[in-house]
């Protein structure tokens, strides 16, 4: 009876369980009734980080200096290269594919702390009564306009991204 499932670190092919290739190696040929799975080590600047049946290894990530990147940890046959940013710059994502001097705070958020050489911009949501309608790396949330002090009334409520809209009071005839 041919197997329908295989053990861990094996795969099913042609009604047969074959061994997966270990990390750092790629598949050359599947096993047969008479031969083991054939695997080959990944080449220079290549890797595979799992037990696999891949026929091609992955290329190590390139830390492009034109994007402000440098190598934090050199890749091996089993691990990818880890990039980081030049000193004073910050990764734009966990994968660190590009660098920014500092991030900006989106509309609805204000700058709580301006970036320094060691820490990125810290943003905070604009609380009720405050707004920010811009992306900025220095502007705080601004208070809503006070219509009352201008002898006007609120015609449109403010949000975290928009100021209130003031208008003239309705005069009773």
């Amino acid at each position: 009876e041919p197997p329908t499932a295989c053990r861990e670190k094996q795969y099913l092919i042609n009604s047969q369980c074959c061994s997966l290739c270990q990390p750092g190696q790629k598949l050359v040929s599947d096993c047969t009734e008479f031969t083991e799975t054939e695997c080959l080590p990944c080449g220079e600047s290549e890797f595979l980080d799992t037990w696999n049946r891949e026929t091609h290894c992955h290329q190590h990530k390139y830390c492009d200096p034109n994007l402000g990147l440098r190598v934090q940890q050199k890749g091996t046959s089993e691990t990818d290269t880890i990039c980081t940013c030049e000193e004073g710059w910050h990764c734009t994502s966990e994968a660190c594919e590009s660098c920014v001097l500092h991030r900006s705070c989106s509309p609805g958020f204000g700058v709580k702390q301006i970036a320094t050489g060691v820490s990125d911009t810290i943003c905070e949501p604009c609380p009720v009564g405050f707004f920010s309608n811009v992306s900025s790396a220095f502007e705080k949330c601004h208070p809503w306009t006070s219509c009352e002090t201008k002898d006007l009334v609120v015609q449109q409520a403010g949000t975290n991204k928009t100021d209130v809209v003031c208008g003239p009071q309705d005069r009773l005839r």
């Epitope: 920014v100 001097l101 992306s135 790396a137």
Partner: nanobody, 116 residues
Framework: EVQLLESGGGLVQPGGSLRLSCAAS???????EMWWVRQAPGKGLERVS?????????YYADSVKGRFTISRDNSKNTLYLQMNSLRADDTAVYHC?????????WGQGTLVTVSS
């Protein structure tokens, strides 16, 4: 292609003044917050000053407050930094940069040397 070209640096005596310019091209200048950032020899990056797109709001680092003035001319696509009462510790390469502040927008900068 975004280009930021800084100019106006040079050698100046302590107490002197300089006006830096940054000519911008390849984007709609009037829509962007702009910054001046400096790097002293062997030191980290210091954020010096910033200005909002309309030129109505500004930021200054404590180290330059009262001495430096940032401004912009949106009709000329140019950012300025007027530096007065210069001190030896203002010696640095000055860069202008734009939101979103990515590395590719980083120009060569202009060197300011304050020395007697």
């Amino acid at each position: 292609e975004v280009q930021l070209l800084e100019s106006g640096g040079g050698l100046v005596q302590p107490g002197g003044s300089l006006r830096l310019s940054c000519a911008a091209s390849g984007f709609t200048f009037r829509d962007y917050e702009m910054w001046w950032v400096r790097q002293a020899p062997g030191k980290g990056l210091e954020r010096v000053s910033a200005i909002n797109p309309q030129g109505t709001r500004t930021y200054y680092a404590d180290s330059v407050k009262g001495r430096f003035t940032i401004s912009r001319d949106n009709s000329k696509n140019t950012l300025y930094l007027q530096m007065n009462s210069l001190r030896a510790d203002d010696t640095a390469v000055y860069h202008c940069t734009k939101l979103p502040f990515i590395f590719e927008y980083w120009g060569q900068g202009t060197l300011v040397t304050v020395s007697s």
